[in-house]
């Protein structure tokens, strides 16, 4: 890991390579409420008219070092009679999120932030724009 | 920013409180290619049968400052001929993200990492699973 | 503070399925993988596979695709493992844990679950 | 997958003893390696994360060092309560993998 000295005056901010060395706090990445979480059901993968299944996507030198990755199951989406509907597609939705990888020429836990696109779920789209009546 | 003095030599890791004191280079966080961000179809919120509107949550104190959030349009899906359907229920896929939030009450560029839960878009789900045959 | 409290010793036929539970309190179920593990004297532990109860996504060792299901049901916070056609090389200890997805690391275990197959 | 050989299979101290243990892996797995105490009847205790890093709660008696292929754990003055099997994994990707163990006995 990388310890910082903790000093008790901060640092100058005004240097041009700041961005290149701040200090982060691993340490308090659970804080996300446990009514949010729990309001999340884990099912919508299988129920949706867009299924999708996860894969667990590791990387040890990555913070998080696991992320699970949508992929769709199909190329259209299941109708109601539980059959695939050729006239609707089921596409992916993707989200880019921020992940922090070691910099493994540098200090075992010295990091650089990098940004990646992952799957999130699926949805089911038309070929065609139409709203709600 | 705090800036950490550089060694030539990679501080102790033996220390049990090394999660709370990482060194992060931010620079490279607009390194993503134009390309990877444009293979991300913004249409799909209208196109979809469950579809989304997307408002954007700021956050000066914040590593990203801005995120894009989804809200489902309608609490059912909209079918073929444009009509909401009462079977089918529209549901925001929600996904955990890491943000950097700056700690105010130590140095200004001192961040400490949070997770926090987005809606990414919306898939249509029926009340039962089915599976396409 | 964190438990993982699994279900007690099993005696099962040649040929059956049984399922092992594996219940979580002290933390946010959802936010947490939970991870099985078998041990045998010969053998040693032997890493099965995981379930995230929050997205419901699961990877199996491929030793074991075919011996073993997790599930999960978030309102009761119990994690599940169904271990099919059973065989004497089934009978082990079976143990769950948590595994920090950020951090990357297996923090808490179960006590284990004994299952001995026998005719 | 990574195997993690651990030697040695037991130890035979008297309290007030150092005691080390070692586990080699067979490719590297950086820093991501994990001691366990297992005491009968007990669930496994997270000792040591990260090669070197010790868990919250843990006596400073316990240590660990490493990175790479080649890991220690060691017990600074054994006491009569650490008589239980100690084991190390790799959390480096999975399968994840374990060593064999080492049944620490006390005279």
């Known amino acids: 890991a990388v310890l910082i000295p903790q000093s008790s005056v901060c640092p100058n901010a005004e240097a041009n390579n700041f961005l290149q060395n701040v200090k982060v706090n691993l340490k308090v990445i659970n804080s996300l409420s446990s009514k949010a979480s729990s309001r999340r059901p884990s099912d919508y993968l299988n129920r949706s008219t867009s299924p999708w299944t996860l894969s667990r996507n590791e990387d040890p030198d990555r913070y998080p070092s696991v992320i699970w990755e949508a992929q769709c199951r199909h190329q259209r989406c299941v109708n109601a009679e539980g059959k695939l509907d050729h006239h609707m597609n089921s596409v992916l939705i993707q989200q880019e999120i921020l992940v922090l990888k070691r910099e493994p020429e540098k200090c075992p836990f010295t990091f650089r932030v990098e940004k990646m696109l992952v799957g999130v779920g699926c949805t089911c789209v038309s070929s065609i724009v139409r709203h709600a009546s | 920013a705090v800036l950490i003095p550089q060694s030539s030599v990679c501080p102790n890791a033996e220390a049990n409180n090394f999660l709370q004191n990482v060194k992060v280079n931010l620079k490279v966080i607009n390194s993503l290619s134009s390309k990877a961000s444009s293979r991300r179809p913004s249409d799909y919120l209208n196109r979809s049968t469950s579809p989304w509107t997307l408002s954007r949550n700021e956050d000066p104190d914040r590593y990203p400052s801005v995120i894009w959030e989804a809200q489902c349009r309608h609490q059912r899906c909209v079918n073929a001929e444009g009509k909401l359907d009462h079977h089918m229920n529209s549901v925001l896929i929600q996904q955990e993200i890491l943000v950097l939030k700056r700690e105010p009450e130590k140095c200004p560029f001192t961040f400490r990492v949070e997770k926090m839960l987005v809606g990414v878009g919306c898939t249509c789900v029926s009340s039962i699973v089915r599976h396409a045959s | 503070q964190v438990q993982l409290q699994q279900s007690g010793a099993e005696l099962v036929r040649p040929g059956a399925s049984v399922k092992l539970s594996c219940k979580a309190s002290?933390?946010?179920?959802?936010?947490?993988?939970i991870h099985w593990v078998k041990q045998t004297p010969v053998h040693g532990l032997a890493w099965i596979g995981v379930i995230h109860p929050g997205n419901g996504g699961t990877a199996y060792n491929q030793k074991f695709k075919d011996k073993a299901t997790l599930t999960a049901d978030k309102s009761s916070s119990t994690a599940y493992m169904e271990l099919s056609s059973l065989t004497s090389e089934d009978s082990a200890v079976y143990y769950c844990e948590r595994f920090l997805t950020y951090e990357g690391y297996f923090d808490y275990w179960g006590q284990g679950t004994t299952l001995t197959v026998s005719s | 997958s990574i195997v993690m050989t651990q030697t040695p299979k037991f130890l035979l101290v008297s309290a007030g003893d150092r005691v080390t243990i070692t586990c080699k892996a067979s490719?590297?797995?950086?820093?991501?390696v994990a001691w366990y105490q297992h005491k009968p009847g007990q669930s496994p205790k997270l000792l040591i994360n990260y090669a070197s890093n010790r868990y919250t709660g843990v006596p400073d008696r316990f240590t660990g060092s490493g990175y790479g292929t080649d890991f220690t754990f060691t017990i600074s003055t054994v006491q009569a309560e650490d008589l239980a099997i100690y084991f190390c994994q790799q959390d480096y990707g999975s399968p994840y993998t374990f060593g064999g163990g080492t049944k620490l006995e006390i005279k």
């Open positions: 490719q590297s797995v950086n820093n991501d």
């Open positions: 002290g933390y946010t179920f959802s936010d947490y993988e």
